[in-house]
Amino acid sequence: ILEAHYTNLKCRCSGVISTVVGLNIIDRIQVTPPGNGCPKTEVVIWTKMKKVICVNPRAKWLQRLLRHVQSKSLSSTPQAPVSKRRAA
């Protein structure tokens, strides 16, 4: 997944945000548990504005969002991104 020039980090997220990302702008979520050389859970969100950001996995809003997504029967499995694709 990492671009070849930037594989010097075992973890993909060098920093995280805790501020709320609205469900309406989220295109895709990926939750990766510890492993593959990274000791922490990482949550990566792709937005509809073509941005990719790392989010604090312990943020309360994220926990609520993941429960909401899972309740819509979208599973959040490691290395298999949860997709919420925009309607054409």
């Epitope: 993909r12 997220c13 895709r28 990566v44 941005k51």
Partner: antibody, heavy 122, light 107 residues
Amino acid sequence: QVTLKESGPEILQPSQTLSLTCTFSGFSLSPYGMGVGWIRQPSGKGLEWLANIWWDDDKYYNPSLINRLTISKDTSNNQAFLKITNVDTTDSATYYCVRSELVMPYVPFDYWGQGVMVTVSS
Amino acid sequence: DIQMTQSPSSMSASLGDRVTITCQASQDIGNDLIWFQQKPGKSPRPLIYYATNLANGVPSRFSGRRSESNYSLTISSLESEDMADYHCLQFKQYPYTFGAGTKLELK
């Protein structure tokens, strides 16, 4: 190995339309997260981002030029295009084709073409 | 649009000098800043991403710092191969905007 190469006219006259082509290899515009864009640099000056096009045909333009710019792509032939209408001498610059990929860490413009120099002159 | 104010526009320094270039953002961009190096006649290449992270293959004499809305690129001990133009880029939001660039020359 990722490469991008720009092509287009070296010289054109004011009021004409500039058509640029970016032909790339080593990646495809099909997969989720892949994008190609255009950046220009007038001689001896700074860089100016012009436009991006993404795998899903989402397009972003620099608002200062939005009425004159059109970006498009031909995914099957690994090409992206930029048209600038009604050019004038201030559009003289080296035009670069650039790649962006929505991975983490996100480094927009991670690969650049060699650039094509365009001169607008009457 | 977010304005990136880069300074100095040009500077000359001697080999071994410590050199610092700065960019100031007109509004909050977090760490969404990249420094590019552009050698004469060449295309730019990413040097530092997310304000402080070194791209692979970049010598450790380069470093990036952030202090609120001020971002700096420092070369701890200047080498001849570092003579180039340096550009900052904010990618917090569209339109992505560059600083005006800094030309680094040998004294």
